[in-house]
């Protein structure tokens, strides 16, 4: 059986939309599937790599690599999107390409970044971990770390940094899929909202779905002990 909830929820474009949340009900009137997984049920994607989920994550990453920061022209906010999802008339799509990106580093002026920009994250304004020396962030936003400390400055002059961020990574469903969404939408969908991250590639949704002890390598499920827990 399915339980359907409909509600008006604030979405990425800053408008409220009617959203449906479909929950697979437990036939035996008990915990939901997500709760059962958290409690240690035999759920194979938590025990070993699942090809379907792996392909989903790779597809999400490929899309994210090509994303940019969509900044609303009315200063109402910004969100990481694909170019096609950013209004050409009501917003500005900040995406580095060709020669428009910043240099990889102050020591390497010739090589320009082509991957980015990312809403609220920039190698030039992140103090920790700083992009410098032997630790220059790669020209692939899906390999960027989470910035734990921003440079102390009210404004940077960068469109993608001085905007009010409207969406962050949200882990939705038992498949461990990730979407950049508003907090409201994420909570309504019973997802896990990552306040600390800017990109889906920075979070490991399956690790969150599985719960219990974190994977030794966040990319590789290793909870073999589930075979004995349940």
């Amino acid at each position: 059986a399915q339980h359907v909830t409909t509600q008006l929820v604030l979405r990425n474009k800053g408008v409220y939309e009617s959203v449906k949340y479909i929950q697979q009900e437990n036939f035996w009137i008990g915990p939901s599937s997500i709760d059962l997984i958290h409690l240690g049920a035999k759920f194979s994607p938590c025990i070993r790599k699942d090809q379907q989920i792996e392909q989903l994550v790779l597809r999400e990453r490929d899309l994210e690599r090509d994303s940019g920061c969509c900044v609303q022209n009315d200063h109402s906010g910004c969100i990481q999107t694909q170019r096609k999802d950013c209004s050409e008339t009501l917003a500005t799509f900040v995406k580095w390409q060709d020669d428009t990106g910043p240099p990889m580093d102050k020591s390497d002026l010739g090589q320009k970044r082509t991957s980015g920009a990312v809403c609220h994250q920039d190698p030039r304004t992140c103090e920790e971990p700083a992009s410098s020396g032997a630790h220059i962030w790669p020209d692939d936003i899906t390999k960027w770390p989470i910035c734990t400390e921003q440079a102390k400055s009210n404004r940077t002059g960068f469109l993608h940094m001085d905007c009010q961020i409207k969406g962050r990574p949200c882990c939705i469903s038992t498949k461990g899929s990730c979407e950049i969404t508003t907090r409201e939408y994420c909570e309504f969908m019973h997802g896990y909202f990552h306040e600390e991250a800017t990109l889906c590639s920075q979070v490991h949704c399956l690790d969150k779905v599985c719960g219990l002890l974190p994977f030794l390598n966040p990319e590789v499920p290793d909870q073999f002990y589930r075979l004995w827990l349940s």
Epitope: D99, S107, L109, G110, R124, T156, G157
Partner: antibody, heavy 123, light 106 residues
Framework: QVTLKESGPGILQPSQTLSLTCSLS??????????VGWIRQPSGKGLEWLAH???????YYNPALKSRLTISKDTSKNQVFLRIANVDTADTATYYC???????????????WGTGTTVTVSS | LIVLTQSPAIMSASPGEKVTMTCGAT?????MFWYQQKPGSSPRVLIY???NLASGVPVRFSGSGSGTSYSLTISRVEAEDVATYYC?????????FGAGTKLELK
């Protein structure tokens, strides 16, 4: 208010070492992303970049003069120094220090300049 | 080494006139920076990233260009614009400036 003030010997003789000091106020060179550069200008001529130093102590020099230049900083005193060894009359110029900024820029630029200090090399 | 060549070396204009000065680079660069130096004063930044006006710079100033060819335009010259204008590149080390364009008033 951000200001930079250069100071130097005024006059020195060929083969001596020129020592310049840039005193910063209104900002700190220990702040992430900050940099300070030295630029000189012979009287009636154009600008020539000499060197710059960043908050993380990375230093960059004009290769044409690199063997003679040394840039350094004292974060506690909020000062930047430039030494030019073995000067000669061609080093006679006004020496400016300038703050490096990247506000809104994909690169960097010299956004605040000092008033400059005049140095004459003469025997 | 990227050499920047400014032209003309000297130009004169009447108040209210539109003037354009150019800066050519020996190699392709991504962005150009422009500085103004009034007689007896230190330089100040006018334009960064080719076309962005620095803080406090009047809107009569504008910059454009790409590749190896860049220009600075003053839409209506005023007496206070009498100065030498320098272009500068930050595309590769060493950082280089153009020799300058001196703007005089007729």
């Amino acid at each position: 208010q951000v200001t930079l003030k250069e100071s130097g010997p005024g006059i020195l003789q060929p083969s001596q070492t020129l020592s310049l000091t840039c005193s910063l106020s209104g900002f700190s060179l220990s702040t992430f992303g900050r940099g300070v550069g030295w630029i000189r200008q012979p009287s009636g001529k154009g600008l020539e970049w000499l060197a710059h130093i960043w908050w993380d102590d990375e230093k960059y020099y004009n290769p044409a003069l690199k063997s003679r230049l040394t840039i350094s900083k004292d974060t506690s005193k909020n000062q930047v120094f430039l030494r030019i060894a073995n000067v000669d009359t061609a080093d006679t110029a006004t020496y400016y220090c300038a703050r490096i900024q990247n506000y809104g820029s994909n690169y960097w630029y010299f956004d605040v300049w000092g008033t400059g200090t005049t140095v004459t090399v003469s025997s | 080494l990227i050499v920047l060549t400014q032209s003309p070396a000297i130009m004169s204009a009447s108040p209210g006139e539109k003037v354009t000065m150019t800066c050519g680079a020996t190699s392709r660069i991504s962005y150009m920076f422009w500085y103004q130096q009034k007689p007896g004063s230190s330089p100040r930044v006018l334009i960064y990233d080719t076309s962005n006006l620095a803080s406090g710079v009047p809107v009569r100033f504008s910059g454009s260009g790409s590749g190896t060819s860049y220009s600075l335009t003053i839409s209506r010259v005023e007496a206070e614009d009498v100065a030498t204008y320098y272009c500068q590149q930050w595309n590769s080390y060493p950082l280089t400036f153009g020799a300058g364009t001196k703007l005089e008033l007729k």
